[in-house]
């Protein structure tokens, strides 16, 4: 019968040829009376057999990632008779893996959005690298993820590639971060290959800023001839948040005379001071009122940022008009 062990050949051998093993018939007494032949895909081009000894050699560099298995056939012939000594037999040559492929991030570019002020441990995104080497061959395709850029705000789970928040971030200070993740094979041991990817992490706004008046005092004038409903001036607050988190409502906090009102222009986010009752210079020539401003939408969990509304003082001078 045929005698052989399992055949393995390392990929990417840089030698001219590589001895893989020996195929022989147990009837072969070593006197060169038998001739061994190799058949099948790769015979003669990738593998050769020493026809006298049955020794098999790889005669070209192999790439496991291109082809990991070769199925060949062997024949052994008695030179004197030309007859087969053994039935033709099929055998397998497996290409064994070396760590010749670096991890690659296939889903680039990565981009994630996470709310500002998210607590430590909040999941941002998972990045995944793949390695073309054999996952069953040692640690050639076992990856470890690490953070090259992004501390102290982010961390990455070494085995999963899950990026989490490790420190609270304020969008109003910085609204986006570039995080660089490295994937290293061989679980980081010597001889490891690595790949990197960049993740753009954008912070979405939360309502963590209350509106604040630009001025602590506004001076306005109103003609005593102005009808009710007249807009006598505008006041303005600023809010570091954006979008609906910066929408605000102005209101009167103090107006003993109940002469004025404030309405909000939601397009410009300005407060418009309106005359609610007609004024008479001869009766009262100036007024002092206090206005306050608050955000339109404040979720319950963010109320801590909005405890005291910003206020401003408005001095209104009444202008005299000659009366007939």
């Amino acid at each position: 019968g045929w005698v052989w062990n399992q055949f393995f050949v390392p990929e990417e051998m840089n030698t001219t040829s590589h001895h893989i093993g020996q195929l022989r018939s147990d009837l072969d007494n070593g006197n060169n009376s038998f001739q061994y032949k190799l058949l099948g895909a790769g015979a003669g081009s990738t593998f050769i057999i020493d026809e006298r000894t049955g020794d098999i050699y790889a005669i070209q560099k192999l790439d496991r990632e291109e082809r990991s298995l070769y199925i060949l056939r062997a024949q052994v012939i008695d030179i004197a008779t030309g007859r087969a000594v053994e039935p033709e037999s099929e055998f397998v040559i497996k290409v064994s893996d070396i760590n010749d492929n670096e991890p690659k991030f296939l889903d680039e570019p990565y981009e994630a959005i996470v709310p500002e002020m998210s607590p430590e441990g909040t999941l941002v995104i998972q990045v995944t690298a793949s390695d073309a080497d054999d996952p069953s061959s040692g640690n050639n395709a076992r990856l470890l993820y690490s953070l090259l850029q992004g501390q102290p705000y982010f961390s990455v789970e070494p085995t999963t590639g899950v990026i989490r928040i490790s420190s609270k971030m304020d969008r109003e200070l910085q609204d986006e971060y570039w995080v660089i993740i490295q994937a290293k094979d061989m679980i980081g041991q010597p001889g490891a290959l690595s790949g990197t990817t960049s993740v753009l992490i954008k912070l979405s706004d939360v309502n963590d800023n209350k509106p604040i008046f630009k001025e602590s005092l506004y001076r306005l004038t109103v003609s005593e001839s102005a009808p009710t409903g007249t807009s006598i001036g505008t006041i303005m607050a600023y809010d570091n948040d954006i979008g609906e988190n910066a929408e605000m409502d102005y209101s009167i906090e103090e107006d003993d005379s109940q002469t004025f009102d404030i309405i909000t222009n939601h397009e410009t986010q300005e407060g418009i001071v309106i005359l609610k009752k007609k004024v008479d210079f001869e009766h009262q020539n100036h007024y002092g009122i206090r206005a306050k401003v608050k955000n339109h939408h404040v979720p319950e969990q963010l109320m801590k940022y909005h405890t005291e509304a910003s206020t401003t003082f408005i001095k209104i001078q009444v202008e005299d008009v000659d009366e007939p």
């Epitope: 840089n14 030698t15 001219t16 081009s45 050769i48 057999i49 020493d50 006298r52 050699y57 005669i59």
Partner: antibody
Framework: QVQLLESGGGLVQPGGSLRLSCAAS????????MNWVRQAPGKGLEWVST????????YYAESVKGRFTISRDNSKSTLYLQMNSLRAEDTAVYHC??????????????WGQGTLVTVSS | EIVMTQSPVTLSLSLGERATLSCRAS??????LAWFQQKPGQAPRLLIY???TRATGIPARFSGSGSGTEFTLTISSLEPEDFAVYYC?????????FGGGTKVEIK
């Protein structure tokens, strides 16, 4: 017995081309790798190129890469070397040599007498 | 590439003397080394392959030894036809490379 007979050498101007042939007999040509080795006048041996038995694998010395092409016609048991962009330093006797068996597949167990290539203006 | 260094460049010996030729590889080439003999106006002839296996028809007075980086060709007793140039060659890595040769001449 194994015989190798080279032909095609001669005088050629720099930048010119030549095609060398090596006719083989006495062995199963397609089962063996074949080589070209050259020897400049009064100098040592220099490997030029190798081709595997089926012709799938070819290898070249850095000095000839991109200029020389090795090929074979197994039906005619003939090995070829197409030499382009020839230079004065390519002047040499060109030998073809048969590969061996097994671990000596890319060896040189039988040599032809050689053909002289002279590159000169 | 692997650099093959042969020594000595010339060896002057008398008939019947023992000749020892050395060949050193710049890095390990296992046992993938061949020795060739070349006489003036002739093609090289294979003497030894696999560092120590004699080629067909080569007399027993020629023997090879060594592995890795250090190799030796020994001619136990020089015959008149042995005076020639001897080359070592590695076939473990591409490009295949030859040593510069050792000339064995009659003293």
């Amino acid at each position: 017995q194994v015989q190798l007979l080279e032909s095609g050498g001669g005088l050629v101007q720099p930048g010119g081309s030549l095609r060398l042939s090596c006719a083989a007999s006495g062995f199963t040509f397609s089962s063996y790798a074949m080589n070209w080795v050259r020897q400049a006048p009064g100098k040592g041996l220099e490997w030029v190129s190798t081709i595997s038995g089926g012709g799938a694998n070819t290898y070249y010395a850095e000095s000839v890469k991109g200029r020389f092409t090795i090929s074979r016609d197994n039906s005619k048991s003939t090995l070829y070397l197409q030499m382009n962009s020839l230079r004065a330093e390519d002047t040499a006797v060109y030998h073809c040599a048969k590969g061996g068996m097994g671990g000596y597949y890319y060896g040189m167990d039988v040599w032809g007498q050689g053909t002289l290539v002279t590159v000169s203006s | 590439e692997i650099v093959m260094t042969q020594s000595p460049v010339t060896l002057s010996l008398s008939l019947g003397e023992r000749a020892t030729l050395s060949c050193r590889a710049s890095q390990s080439i296992s046992s993938n080394l061949a020795w060739f003999q070349q006489k003036p106006g002739q093609a090289p002839r294979l003497l030894i392959y696999g560092a120590f296996t004699r080629a067909t028809g080569i007399p027993a007075r020629f023997s090879g030894s060594g592995s890795g980086t250090e190799f030796t060709l020994t001619i136990s007793s020089l015959e008149p036809e042995d005076f020639a140039v001897y080359y070592c060659q590695q076939y473990n890595y591409w490009p295949l490379t030859f040593g510069g040769g050792t000339k064995v001449e009659i003293k």
